[in-house]
Interface confidence: low
């Protein structure tokens, strides 16, 4: 003869794949203190238990090592711990208490466990700013993972130079020493739960601060096509009276501050233009000589110079001789 008792709490519980859940169970208060027996958790419809404290009883292979009976008759505890939840754990379960010396056992009401797709994703935290050439520790964490589950496997993917730091059950540290070319590239942390065969990932775009590496001048002369200067140039022939537009361009993150100077400027020199554009509407003797574009950045500056050589128009000189 079986005696029934009601499981306390909800009739169903939800757990995400790969995570853990505790199915609460309290032994009936009517249970005699002298009652000695074994506890068994069953999946509805199956006669092999999923968990038990009976050393002579085999449990289902599917649940072995993942389902545990938390047995403490003094505290009336008969809860079921499920770790590394799998989709196929989606079922109804009940608890049975039986004794070899008693005529009757106790059987609980049923409780449904719903296993849902894993929606949590890893968090990637970056302390402060990523600076080119400086190591930074990035942490990929899964704070929603339970300690008693099979430790997840952390995988990092990045084009930047990296090395693995310490890890815990819930986090992994990656030391990254980014280069300028790593700015805006992807870094992925992937977390695999081997117990459930589930993988989640998060991808971030690296924001790498770096000083300008390249500075260039594009020259627009009248209506003719622009051309670009990538290194200091000794002289650029320009026709007197011609309009000239000099466009300075530099990389760097955050963007470098561009300014134009006449001549080779001292550090505290006053710029003739506070942008990357220098307009020379009519080139004359005042414009002959050097023009320098400086790309200023908190992490370092770079400059490029251009020397203008004015070709005088013959008629422009006739009256002055």
């Amino acid at each position: 003869q079986e005696r029934r008792f009601q499981l306390e709490g909800p009739e169903s519980l939800t757990v995400q794949e790969g995570l853990c859940v505790l199915v609460p169970c309290r032994l009936p208060t009517t249970l005699p203190a002298s009652y000695y027996g074994y506890g068994y958790w069953f999946l509805e419809g199956a006669d092999v238990p999923v968990a038990t404290n009976d050393p002579d009883e085999e449990v289902q292979e599917e649940t072995r090592g993942r389902f545990h009976l938390l047995w403490d008759p003094r505290r009336k505890n008969c809860s079921l711990s499920i770790r590394d939840a799998r989709r196929r754990d989606n079922a109804a379960y009940f608890f049975r208490l039986k004794s070899k010396w008693m005529k009757y056992g106790y059987t609980s009401s049923k409780l449904s466990v719903r296993v849902m797709a894993l929606t949590h994703r890893p968090n990637i935290s970056i302390p402060g700013t990523l600076e080119s050439g400086h190591p930074s520790n990035l942490t990929c964490s899964v704070p929603w993972v339970c300690e008693q589950g099979t430790p997840p496997i952390f995988s990092w993917m990045s084009a930047a130079p990296t090395s693995l730091g310490p890890r815990t059950t819930q986090s992994s540290v990656l030391t990254i020493t980014p280069r300028p070319q790593d700015h805006s590239t992807n870094l992925t942390c992937q977390v695999t739960f081997p117990g459930a065969g589930v993988t989640m990932e998060r991808t971030i775009q690296l924001n790498v601060s770096y000083a300008p590496q390249k500075v260039a001048i594009s020259i627009f002369q009248g209506n003719s096509a622009a051309f670009k200067i990538l290194q200091n140039t000794s002289s650029l022939p320009v026709l007197e009276g011609q309009a000239l537009r000099l466009l300075c361009d530099a990389d760097g993150n955050p963007p470098a501050h561009l300014s134009w100077f006449q001549g080779f400027p001292a550090l505290n020199a006053t710029p003739i233009s506070n942008t990357g554009v220098l307009e020379l509407p009519q080139v004359g003797s005042a414009e002959e000589g050097d023009f320098t574009c400086r790309a200023q950045h908190p992490l370092g500056s770079l400059q490029i110079s251009l020397s203008l050589f004015v070709h005088w128009k013959p008629e422009g000189r006739a009256g002055g001789v």
Epitope: L164, T188, G197
Partner: antibody, heavy 121, light 106 residues
Framework: QVQLQQPGAELVKPGASVKLSCKAS????????IHWVKQRPGQGLEWIGM????????NYNEKLKIKATLTVDKSSSTAYMQLSSLTSEDSAVYYC??????????????WGTGTTVTVSS | QIVLSQSPAILSASPGEKVTMTCRAS?????MNWYQQKPGSSPKPWIY???NLASGVPARFSGSGSGTPYSLTISRVEAEDAATYYC?????????FGSGTKLEIK
């Protein structure tokens, strides 16, 4: 060029063991699982298990767990599979493969050259 | 574990013909991968995540389906397509493969 290089063939006696190797090149070895797949002559493909090169954590196909032991040597970017107590049923081509990680899908994007294991006395 | 059944086992087609092969899962899966294998060679990824062609796969190949079944279609078969095609799932652990469809060109 991403490659998984495996020895061409192994001839072993029944009851013996064999250790197959899979050398990776052309990518960051520690960023990808190595999987092993079995193909018996004229038959389909069967997943044996996987190993992650950073932790060495393994996950096996329960059906073949007794037969295979997966290990890894990070320093040489090589994965190994030891097959024990070999019988004629284990005569097959064994492939190692790399898994591509998509946001919502997995597939084997790189396969090894395959090692033909022949169990014969 | 999920069982994948492929049909037909052998498919014979003439160049230029349209062919479709099917992969049926014993329970619903969220996506399907396909691999091509030629005799004496390793399998090659062919279609991943149901409908995405792997690198270098001609546009005459396409994949479709959801839940179950899934299919691989070749709009106009060419001689170089002669091979065995395997479907594979990993919606449920462990990953499983179909038994293969062998495509023969007449």
């Amino acid at each position: 060029q991403v490659q998984l290089q495996q020895p061409g063939a192994e001839l072993v006696k029944p009851g013996a063991s064999v250790k197959l190797s899979c050398k990776a090149s052309g990518y960051t070895f520690t960023n990808y699982y190595i999987h092993w797949v079995k193909q018996r002559p004229g038959q389909g493909l069967e997943w044996i298990g996987m190993i992650h090169p950073i932790s060495g954590s393994t996950n096996y196909n329960e059906k073949l767990k007794i037969k295979a032991t997966l290990t890894v040597d990070k320093s040489s970017s090589t994965a190994y599979m030891q097959l024990s107590s070999l019988t004629s049923e284990d005569s097959a081509v064994y492939y190692c493969a790399r898994r591509y990680y998509g946001s919502s899908y997995w597939y084997f994007d790189v396969w090894g050259t395959g090692t033909t294991v022949t169990v014969s006395s | 574990q999920i069982v994948l059944s492929q049909s037909p086992a052998i498919l014979s087609a003439s160049p230029g013909e349209k062919v479709t092969m099917t992969c049926r899962a014993s329970s619903s899966v969220s996506y399907m991968n396909w691999y091509q294998q030629k005799p004496g060679s390793s399998p090659k990824p062919w279609i991943y995540a149901t409908s995405n062609l792997a690198s270098g796969v001609p546009a005459r190949f396409s994949g479709s389906g959801s839940g179950t079944p899934y299919s691989l279609t070749i709009s106009r078969v060419e001689a170089e397509d002669a091979a065995t095609y395997y479907c594979q799932q990993w919606s449920s652990h462990p990953p499983t493969f179909g038994s293969g469809t062998k495509l023969e060109i007449k």
